[in-house]
Interface confidence: low
C-alpha cells in the first residue's frame, strides 16, 4: 500500500514562503490523484488542493488560490505544496493524502506555524 | 487485454427515431475506487478522424447535441441517439480506458432507413 511521509513544515513569519514535500513509498504513485488536507489546531479538516495523475489538472480551495501551488514529480514519487504569502490562519498540520475519490492513505502530517 | 464487442455491426433507423448501439467489455471497466466507468464513445464520419461524444460512460462532451446519451455500468454499455438526424450517419465506436492498454469496439455503422 505504501507510506506517505511529509516534510518541510516549521515556524515561519507572516508573508514568508514554505515548500512542503511528501514522498510516497508505494508502487502506484503516478496512478493516483493526490491531495493536501490541512487541520488547524483543534479544528476540523480542510481540503486544500489536489493534482491529477500526470500533473496537468490542479484544483484549490478558494482561500488559498493564487498563494498555494501544488506539483508532483512522478519519477521521484513526490508531491509538493508551495505556500506563499503565509498568513497566521495558515497555521495547521498539513497532510499529504492519496485521493482516489476517497482519501484512503494519509501521511502523518507536517506542522506549519505562522507567527511573529 | 480487455476486448470490447459492439452490437449490431450495422443499424438502419428512420429519421426522428431512436438508435441504440450496445457495447460489451470482456471484464468490468467500473473502477471500484471511484465508481467511474472508464468508457468513451466516438463518432466517425467518412474521411474524418473520430470525434469524442461521451466519456465516463455517460458524460457528454461539450458541444455534443443532447440527443446523444450514454448509459450502462460494469461490462454493458449503450449509446442512444434519441431522435436520429441526417448528420448522425457515421460509424460509432466504444473504447475502454481502464488501463494504459486501451481498446476499441469494432464499430457500428449507422444509416438512415429509407
Amino acid at each position: 500500500e505504501g507510506q506517505l511521509v511529509e516534510s518541510g513544515g516549521g515556524l515561519v513569519q507572516p508573508g514568508r514562503s514554505l515548500r512542503l514535500s511528501c514522498v510516497d513509498s508505494g508502487f502506484s504513485f503516478s496512478n493516483n490523484w493526490m491531495s493536501w488536507v490541512r487541520q488547524s489546531p483543534g479544528k476540523g479538516l480542510e481540503w486544500v488542493a489536489n493534482i491529477n495523475e500526470d500533473g496537468s489538472e490542479k484544483h484549490f480551495v478558494d482561500s488559498v488560490k493564487g498563494r498555494f501551488t501544488i506539483s508532483r514529480d512522478n519519477v521521484k514519487n513526490s508531491l509538493y505544496l508551495e505556500i506563499n504569502s503565509l498568513r497566521v490562519e495558515d497555521t495547521a498540520v498539513y497532510y499529504c493524502v492519496r485521493n482516489n475519490s476517497y482519501f484512503n492513505v494519509w501521511g502523518q502530517g507536517t506542522t506549519v506555524t505562522v507567527s511573529l | 487485454d480487455i476486448v470490447m464487442t459492439q452490437s449490431p455491426d450495422s443499424l438502419a433507423v428512420s429519421l426522428g427515431e431512436r438508435a441504440t448501439i450496445n457495447c460489451k467489455s470482456s471484464q468490468t471497466i467500473l473502477h471500484r475506487r471511484n465508481n467511474k466507468n472508464y468508457l468513451a464513445w466516438y463518432q466517425q464520419k467518412p474521411g474524418q478522424p473520430p470525434k469524442l461524444l461521451i466519456y465516463w460512460a455517460s458524460i457528454r462532451e461539450s458541444g455534443v447535441p443532447d440527443r446523444f446519451s450514454g448509459s450502462g455500468s460494469g461490462t454493458d454499455f449503450s449509446l442512444i441517439i434519441s431522435s436520429l438526424q441526417p448528420e448522425d450517419v457515421a460509424v460509432y465506436y466504444c473504447q475502454q480506458y481502464n488501463n494504459s492498454l486501451c481498446s476499441f469496439g469494432q464499430g457500428t455503422k449507422l444509416e438512415i432507413k429509407r
Epitope: S30, W47, H59, D62 | L52
Partner: antibody
Framework: EVKLVESGGGLVQPGGSLSLSCAAS????????MNWVRQPPGKALEWLAL??????????EYSASLKGRFTISRDNSQSILYLQMNALRAEDSATYYC???????????WGQGTTLTVSS | DIVLTQSPASLAVSLGQRATISCRAS??????????MQWYQQKSGQPPKLLIR???NVESGVPARFSGSGSGTDFSLNIHPVEEDDIAMYFC?????????FGGGTKLEIK
C-alpha cells in the same frame, strides 16, 4: 487551438520501413500522454502505442499485436510525435492517427490521419 | 461548494451502546449511482483514518461494528457496540465536487 498534423504516410513494399510524424500545437505538449491509433480501410480503430508525459518519464506502452516492430517516440523541443514502423506487412495498411490523451484517459483530440499502403 | 453539516458536535455514549453520527450535505453527492461520501476516524495526535467509502463500504481492516448508511444528502455513521478504542473525532467528507469538503467533526466520548 489544439492541432495535430500527421505526415509521412505513403506506399511501401512489404518488409520495408517508414517513420510517421505528428506536429502538435496549441497545448503544452510535455504535459500530455500521446497515442497512435490506426484504422485499416473500412475497418475498426486499433490502438497501437502511447508515450507518457514528462511527469511520468516519457515511458511507453504498446499493443501486443505489434510484436516489437513499431517504436513510438517524441521530440519535446519541437512538439513532434513519431512512429517508427519496421518489417511492414500488407495488414499494416491503414490510416494512422495521432491522438492526444486527456487527463482522464480518454482521447480528446485527433489528427486528420496519414495513410500507409503496404503493397508490392 | 458542497457544505457538510455534522451532528451532534459531541456525543457521549456508554460502552456497548450504539453511537450514531449524522452528516447532511447541502446538495446531493450521488454520482453514477454511488454516494461519494466518506467517513474518517481521527485519534488524538494521529492523521485521519478512512473507515467508510462511498457511504456504505467498510474499508478493509475496520471492525464490523462500524457501518455507514444513507444516500443523496443524508448520511450516518453507526458504531455498535461502542468500545473504549473508539474514542476519537469522526469526520464525513464528500468527493462529488471540487473543492472536496469535510464536515465539522463529531467528538465521541465514553459516558
Amino acid at each position: 487551438e489544439v492541432k495535430l498534423v500527421e505526415s509521412g504516410g505513403g506506399l511501401v513494399q512489404p518488409g520495408g520501413s517508414l517513420s510517421l510524424s505528428c506536429a502538435a500545437s496549441g497545448f503544452t505538449y510535455t504535459d500530455y500522454y500521446m497515442n497512435w491509433v490506426r484504422q485499416p480501410p473500412g475497418k475498426a480503430l486499433e490502438w497501437l502505442a502511447l508515450i507518457r508525459n514528462k511527469a511520468n518519464g516519457y515511458t511507453t506502452e504498446y499493443s501486443a499485436s505489434l510484436k516489437g516492430r513499431f517504436t513510438i517516440s517524441r521530440d519535446n523541443s519541437q512538439s513532434i510525435l513519431y512512429l517508427q514502423m519496421n518489417a511492414l506487412r500488407a495488414e499494416d495498411s491503414a490510416t494512422y492517427y495521432c491522438v492526444r490523451e486527456n487527463i482522464n484517459y480518454y482521447f480528446d483530440y485527433w489528427g486528420q490521419g496519414t495513410t500507409l499502403t503496404v503493397s508490392s | 461548494d458542497i457544505v457538510l453539516t455534522q451532528s451532534p458536535a459531541s456525543l457521549a455514549v456508554s460502552l456497548g451502546q450504539r453511537a450514531t453520527i449524522s452528516c447532511r450535505a447541502s446538495e446531493s453527492v450521488e454520482y453514477f449511482g454511488a454516494s461519494l461520501m466518506q467517513w474518517y476516524q481521527q485519534k488524538s495526535g494521529q492523521p485521519p483514518k478512512l473507515l467508510i467509502r462511498a457511504a456504505t463500504n467498510v474499508e478493509s481492516g475496520v471492525p464490523a461494528r462500524f457501518s455507514g448508511s444513507g444516500s443523496g444528502t443524508d448520511f450516518s455513521l453507526n458504531i455498535h457496540p461502542v468500545e473504549e478504542d473508539d474514542i476519537a473525532m469522526y469526520f464525513c467528507q464528500q468527493s462529488r465536487k471540487v473543492p472536496w469538503t469535510f464536515g465539522g467533526g463529531t467528538k465521541l466520548e465514553i459516558k
